[in-house]
């Protein structure tokens, strides 16, 4: 039995780890699933952040795992992306759905960050250069669209390179190769890692390597 307190919990199940799998919500002591109608990266971002897996990698329209069972608790989930919990997003009401089946259970793949790396290259030292991120074993770049000093601040702090001195686009530090992992990132400058900034999804972009972004951090400028 339970006395008071919130009666909702969230988990991902049947995935490779706690940060991937079918989305399940516990409401009134019962675990149930979420229907994928209107499923979006904003919802995935909320889930990943809520579970302490702050990188939203992808949002399968349905669970890329076995279908769930029990109640379908949520449908038409609509998030802004800044909600602190999935149940703060709009939906059709608890247990209300439009004839969903468990074949439409929503799934999520987040990352715990442990398989991610970042470096700056072609800048003459470790604290300046083109931004490169290793994701799923492949090094890739970041597009300069809407890139600004807030993004640079996150990168410099993450790499323990001090503060951001400047940022550049148009492949100022040369064109990279491989995937372009990020485009149109939205950072407030306080994120602990670049991949914790809001984004459209890994590898989603409309760029080419002529738009690769770079930064110069204060510790890099000192070495120049």
């Amino acid at each position: 039995s339970s006395l008071g307190g919130t009666d909702k919990e969230l988990r991902l199940v049947d995935g490779e780890n706690k940060c991937s799998g079918r989305v399940e919500v516990k409401v009134q002591e019962e675990w149930g699933t979420v229907c994928n109608n209107g499923w979006s990266m904003e919802a995935v971002s909320v889930i990943c952040n809520q579970l302490g897996c702050p990188t939203a990698i992808k949002a399968p329209g349905w669970a890329n795992s076995s279908a769930g069972s029990g109640r379908i608790w949520m449908d038409h989930v609509s998030c802004r992306g800044n909600e602190s919990a999935l149940w703060d997003c709009k939906h059709d009401g608890w247990g209300k759905h439009s004839n969903c089946t468990h074949q439409q259970d929503a799934g999520v793949t987040c990352s715990d960050g442990s398989n991610l790396e970042m470096r700056l290259t072609r800048g003459g030292n470790m604290c300046s250069g083109r931004i490169e991120i290793k994701f799923q074993g492949r090094w890739g770049t970041v597009c300069d669209d809407n890139f600004n000093i807030d993004h640079a601040s996150v990168i410099c702090r993450q790499l323990e390179c001090g503060s951001a001195v400047s940022f550049s686009g148009s492949s100022n530090f040369g064109e990279g190769s491989g995937p372009i992992w990020f485009d149109d990132l939205i950072c407030n400058g306080n994120e602990s890692a670049l991949w914790n900034c809001k984004h459209q999804g890994w590898g989603k972009h409309n760029c080419d390597h002529a738009e690769d972004a770079g930064v110069i951090c204060s510790k890099g400028a000192d070495l120049s």
Epitope: S1, S2, T6, W94, G95
Partner: antibody, heavy 116, light 107 residues
């Protein structure tokens, strides 16, 4: 359609234990839903007392501390409320209420007076 | 516990009027607010769930809106059978709590 019917003593003496029963018709109590008790004081204020889910798990309002117990009798398709150590402040109309999550179905209520 | 503060506590209106009742939560309850109508000697009747969704069989003149802490029940054109007491309640977290009620009377 779920139908709920409360039954109880009407009058209870202070310090005694109140026992109320809700008989459910049109639906099996073990199939689904949360089964709640809600009371309404003479001034019209509503208070949720607690729930028992079809799975058997219970939730109680902390304001009632350990005075409240909700249980199910599946053989009779009933659920019950026990409230111990009653006082005049427990005088109210008691409703049994159910729904998947929301308070969708209400009984007509039973009025309880606590008086010596 | 989340406190639901309803206003006004009583309201006089005429048939055909547009009436608005408000409910404020002491902390955010997302959209998890329900509205109930109660007539003398009867149990509360659910009108709205999840802030704005109409319960089955409830006339479309009733509508709900709001999210976070501020919520509204609106009756677009009062009918004689709408004079009653109205309650809001939050479904966001345990313990579920209710507003103190608004008595809607005939002017």
């Amino acid at each position: 359609q779920v139908q709920l019917q409360e039954s109880g003593p009407g009058l209870v003496k202070p310090s005694e234990t109140l026992s109320l029963t809700c008989t459910v018709s049109g639906y099996s109590i073990t199939s689904d839903y949360a089964w709640n008790w809600i009371r309404q004081f003479p001034g019209k204020k509503l208070e949720w007392m607690g729930s028992i889910y079809y799975s058997g798990s219970t939730y109680y309002n902390p304001s009632l501390k350990s005075r409240v117990t909700i249980s199910v009798d599946t053989s009779k398709n009933q659920f019950s409320l026990k409230l111990s150590s009653v006082t005049a402040a427990d005088t109210a109309t008691y409703y049994c209420v159910s729904g998947t999550y929301y308070f969708d179905y209400w009984g007509q209520g039973t009025t309880l007076t606590v008086s010596s | 516990d989340i406190v639901m503060t309803q206003s006004p506590s009583s309201l006089s209106a005429s048939v055909g009027d547009r009436v608005t009742i408000t409910c404020r939560a002491s902390q955010s309850v997302s959209s998890d607010v329900a509205w109930f109508q109660q007539k003398p000697g009867k149990s509360p009747k659910p009108l709205i769930y999840y802030a704005s969704s109409l319960q089955s069989g409830v006339p479309s003149r009733f509508s709900g809106s709001g999210s976070g802490t501020d919520f509204t029940l609106t009756i677009s054109s009062l009918q004689a059978e709408d004079f009653a007491v109205y309650f809001c309640g939050q479904d966001y977290t345990s313990p579920r709590t209710f507003g103190g009620g608004t008595k809607l009377e005939i002017k």
